[in-house]
Every structure is written in structure tokens, then in C-alpha cells.
């Protein structure tokens, strides 16, 4: 079974800068899985943001601007990254990665 670790406990960024979050996959080949990213804003329900599937297909939540989030995966380090562009106060949240094993 696959295991996920998000090594960054927290990330502090200046407004308008870029934040990059990592999710390390172990126990399974990242190229054979789909990785999903969610966020939980304070006091709000958890929300799907974006996913990257085994074949590289990227899906994002409707209504999220196309340039706001980027998702990628690096097979060499078995890592998925979520990039948050133009960081705003509304981006303050806990970000979770999740795994779907194909």
C-alpha cells in the first residue's frame, strides 16, 4: 500500500509570492497512481483543488483560475508538488495530498 508524507510542517510566504508544497509517495510507484490535492481553510469544509493522474492528466476544481495552482510529479524523487501562485490571504489553509492507487 502507498504511503504519503508531507515533509513541510508549514510554509510562510510573502503576499504575491509563490508557495511550493511537497508530497512524498512511498510504497508504490508514483507513476502508477493519481495524486489529489485538497485545502481546508479555517472554519470551512475541505475542498478539492487539483489532481494529477498516472498518465499525467491534470484536473482542477471548476471555478479555480487556471493559473492559480499547478500540480506536478517528479518520478525520480517520488514527489508530487503543488505550486500556489500569487499567494493571497485567502490561501491561508491546511493543504492535504491524497493517493488513489490504480
Amino acid at each position: 500500500a502507498g504511503h504519503l508524507e508531507q515533509p513541510q510542517i508549514s510554509s510562510t510566504k510573502t503576499l504575491s509570492k509563490t508557495a511550493r508544497l511537497e508530497c512524498v509517495v512511498s510504497g508504490i510507484t508514483i507513476s502508477a497512481t493519481s495524486v489529489y490535492w485538497y485545502r481546508e481553510r479555517p472554519g470551512e469544509v475541505i475542498q478539492f483543488l487539483v489532481s494529477i493522474s498516472y498518465d499525467g492528466t491534470v484536473r482542477k476544481e471548476s471555478g479555480i483560475p487556471s493559473g492559480k495552482f499547478e500540480v506536478d510529479r517528479i518520478p525520480e524523487t517520488s514527489t508530487s508538488t503543488l505550486t500556489i501562485h500569487n499567494v493571497e490571504k485567502q490561501d491561508i489553509a491546511t493543504y492535504y495530498c491524497a493517493l488513489w492507487e490504480v
Epitope: S53, D55, G56, T57, V58, R59, K60, E61, S62, P65, S66, G67, E70
Partner: nanobody, 125 residues
């Protein structure tokens, strides 16, 4: 609403090249991931290539890898498909399509919000 118009199709000999273009009008072009599909007579519509919202990621069907190149110009609202080393089996009607929420080879045709009318590509042997 987005209107997509393809151009650049035609008749070419095997081994030749064509460049297809798709021009979008309407809402912000960069909000859409773009894809090219093709449909040969009597066959299902199949994925050819796609490009992400920013243009930073491209995807190709195995049958066209190394021969076709997809690119986009968000300033000009266009996406192009450069097709080299064409083969008779590339003969089909080629469609461009736009998706707000999906980018890549796994996007179902239903995940594309807008489609062009298609342009015919014929490769003779």
C-alpha cells in the same frame, strides 16, 4: 462562450508536413487547456495532443510522438499542431477543443467544453 475555428488542413504526400491552427474567440483563452483530436471515417474520435493552460506541459498520443508538436500563443488566442513525417494513417478530420478543468491524455471528450468544426487532413501514399 468560446468559438474555435481550425485551419491549415489539406492534401499532402506521405512524409510531408502540415501545420494546423485553431483560433479562439470569446472568453479568456488562457483559461482553457487545449487539445487536438482526430476522427477517421468509420472510427471513433481519438486523442492526438494536448497542452496545458500555461503551455508549460504538453501531451501526445503514442502514435504521433516525435512527429507532431503542439504549441499555443495566449497573446494571439491560437493553438497550433505542427505535423511532420505524415503517414497515410494520419488521414482524418482534425478537431481542436477547449477545456476549463482538464488537461492531458486522460481527459474524456465530455470534459472538453468547446469544439471546433474540424479540418480535413488527407495523406496520400
Amino acid at each position: 462562450e468560446v468559438q474555435l475555428v481550425e485551419s491549415g488542413g489539406g492534401l499532402v504526400q506521405a512524409g510531408g508536413s502540415l501545420r494546423l491552427s485553431c483560433t479562439a474567440s470569446g472568453r479568456t483563452f488562457s483559461s482553457y487547456a487545449m487539445g487536438w483530436f482526430r476522427q477517421a471515417p468509420g472510427k471513433e474520435r481519438e486523442f492526438v495532443a494536448a497542452i496545458s493552460w500555461s503551455g508549460g506541459t504538453t501531451y501526445y498520443a503514442d502514435s504521433v510522438k516525435g512527429r507532431f508538436t503542439i504549441s499555443r500563443d495566449n497573446a494571439k488566442n491560437t493553438v497550433s499542431l505542427q505535423m511532420n513525417s505524415l503517414k497515410p494513417e494520419d488521414t482524418a478530420v482534425y478537431f481542436c477543443a477547449a477545456s476549463l478543468d482538464c488537461s492531458g491524455p486522460g481527459c474524456h471528450t465530455a470534459e472538453y467544453d468547446y469544439w471546433g468544426q474540424g479540418t480535413q487532413v488527407t495523406v496520400s501514399s
